[in-house]
Amino acid sequence: KSPIFGPEEVNSVEGNSVSITCYYPPTSVNRHTRKYWCRQGARGGCITLISSEGYVSSKYAGRANLTNFPENGTFVVNIAQLSQDDSGRYKCGLGINSRGLSFDVSLEVSQGPGLLNDTKVYTVDLGRTVTINCPFKTENAQKRKSLYKQIGLYPVLVIDSSGYVNPNYTGRIRLDIQGTGQLLFSVVINQLRLSDAGQYLCQAGDDSNSNKKNADLQVLKPEPELVYEDLRGSVTFHCALGPEVANVAKFLCRQSSGENCDVVVNTLGKRAPAFEGRILLNPQDKDGSFSVVITGLRKEDAGRYLCGAHSDGQLQEGSPIQAWQLFVNEESTIPRSPTVVKGVAGSSVAVLCPYNRKESKSIKYWCLWEGAQNGRCPLLVDSEGWVKAQYEGRLSLLEEPGNGTFTVILNQLTSRDAGFYWCLTNGDTLWRTTVEIKIIEGEPNLKVPGNVTAVLGETLKVPCHFPCKFSSYEKYWCKWNNTGCQALPSQDEGPSKAFVNCDENSRLVSLTLNLVTRADEGWYWCGVKQGHFYGETAAVYVAVEERKAAGSRDVSLAKADAAPDEKVLDSGFREIENKAIQDPRLFAEEKAVADTRDQADGSRASVDSGSSEEQGGSSRHHHHHH
């Protein structure tokens, strides 16, 4: 069986594009060998239409490309301007066509709304590609084919079938003569310049019986689209440059003085420092289109932006481009929020994320910005109950306080949680905010034991020590689970002795679990809040073991009990009762609570974490494991 894999069947309509991904084992040999797309004939052969070595059949001229992604073990064939003639059986493969390293693909193109007939007037955007079609009669099939451009009173030869190319068009023009069945030749001009506009004449033959056709080429400089966005909000530039530049480097630049255009971001890895943490370049499709999202808009972001494609990742003559004029509205509907939130290692952060209050039912998301490649923001949590597995027990997205704000709580912070995080919804895309989480040195304010082992059927008491700075706050214990952090009854045991230089206003608040059952195992949070505004939290993992001796357990800060018969696995998990749970002792030293001056006293931004060794959770919502 061939190791190549792809879609068995692709269905589309006339005029549409398809993007066919073929997968191969990414061995060193496979990554570098020839990739091809061929059409199967009735007699069993397979005629190459396009390959990774640069060959493109005349049938695909100007409308198809093949891009190899060796790091993924994939290559993508894009075919645009589909017609019913494209319906048939194809193969995508590696090496030579006759070998078995291929996959069969059936392409079915049904009748669409109808395509426009070819016209003598070609209106094309700057930097794009034009195909000028030139019909001829049978008697001129073997004769010279040529294209002239009318300069003043005189026609100047641009290209002909004997191999001549006018120097002004070198490297960006070709003449294709269709198969013998079609009495048509085509001239394809890429990377159109403004100077290419004008009257053209194509000709087959040189005598009085020659066939001639006039063409009027209009090259349009894109008018900038006016974009008005709010200060602190978000803008998305959608850039559709056409399939012919699908495998050419893309860029977004901002015009400065004169014709200079400073690169904001490109697919070659360049990113302007001013946009760190607040920009993503998303290849939306393999047809050459992409989008750039910029969040946390600033006054100085206003200006003219161009997106384009060029091999060196910046604006050059002949780059296909789109343009926008961005205006940043300073009378913003988006509330101010800190652009930086600080958290102490081992502690927590509680971040307020703004959203459009008209969209209270929208799904809220929180993601971690990653700068690698072109930037991405993988989701960590959403308001429908999904939490990334590594964050169970330490991450929660709450709809509170509501009315245009939701809260994200992240605890057990480590240095790996430092970075940029985005708050967003599936509604108004303009309401995307960015916050940078910085991890600072210091001691957690809340003090809890590192981890706790409870005994079945007995009573367990878990302490949480609150310093005096939280005297006016509501103190709570809750059990984190897949549906949220359910509030539990707790007891105020009076002043805490865990703090030096702290008066009677410090508090020891205990959680008591009576008649412990298996269901009591899990993560417990203690924390502070003021109304619907959350402050610091601290997390404790409670493991449950069989009864060894009678009595109740009262856990002090000094204790960090491990189940006596546990087996510590290399992966950093431990087995208790044949159930693998993450070992809280792995990060007992890292347990932390964020500095509440940045938290309960008014963090107004989103937060996040990236520790792969810790669990994460969600509050007051449903959660699914995948």
Epitope: E9, V10, S12, V13, N72, T74, S362, N426
Partner: nanobody, 130 residues
């Protein structure tokens, strides 16, 4: 809350046919790809078939072991996917799981990889008797 509910499983004789359905529901949930995996006792989860759509274009993928026998399709709304199982064999006995992807990925994912799917159903048992 997003839910994928499989139905149509049951007992079928070798050489027979069965049609599985998977309905996706949930507030504002609109998948862009749905697929089927199966898991026989003691074996890894195996890719069966998937369907992905973009505008008027549909891409169908089928696993090696079921090629030519199983076909995948979807309803016009795109929230229900079907697996038509023909010429079934005893080795097709397994729990069949429906999978769905909520958002298009920035880079093309391999539909055969269970890790690349966001949502899963609880599964429906298909038993092929000889």
């Amino acid at each position: 809350e997003v839910q994928l509910v499989e139905s149509g499983g049951g007992l079928v004789q070798t050489g027979g046919s069965l049609r599985l359905s998977c309905a996706a529901s949930g507030r504002t949930f609109s998948p862009y790809a749905m697929g089927w995996f199966r898991q026989a006792p003691g074996k890894e989860r195996e890719f069966v078939a998937a369907i992905r759509w973009s505008g008027a274009t549909t891409y169908k993928y089928v696993g090696d072991s079921v090629q030519g026998r199983f076909t995948i399709s979807r309803d016009a709304a795109g929230n229900t996917v079907y697996l038509q199982m023909n010429s079934v064999k005893p080795e097709d006995t397994a729990v069949y799981y429906c999978a769905a992807d909520r958002v298009p990925k920035d880079i093309s994912i391999d539909p055969r990889n269970p890790k690349d799917w966001d949502y899963w159903g609880k599964g429906t048992l298909v038993t092929v008797s000889s």
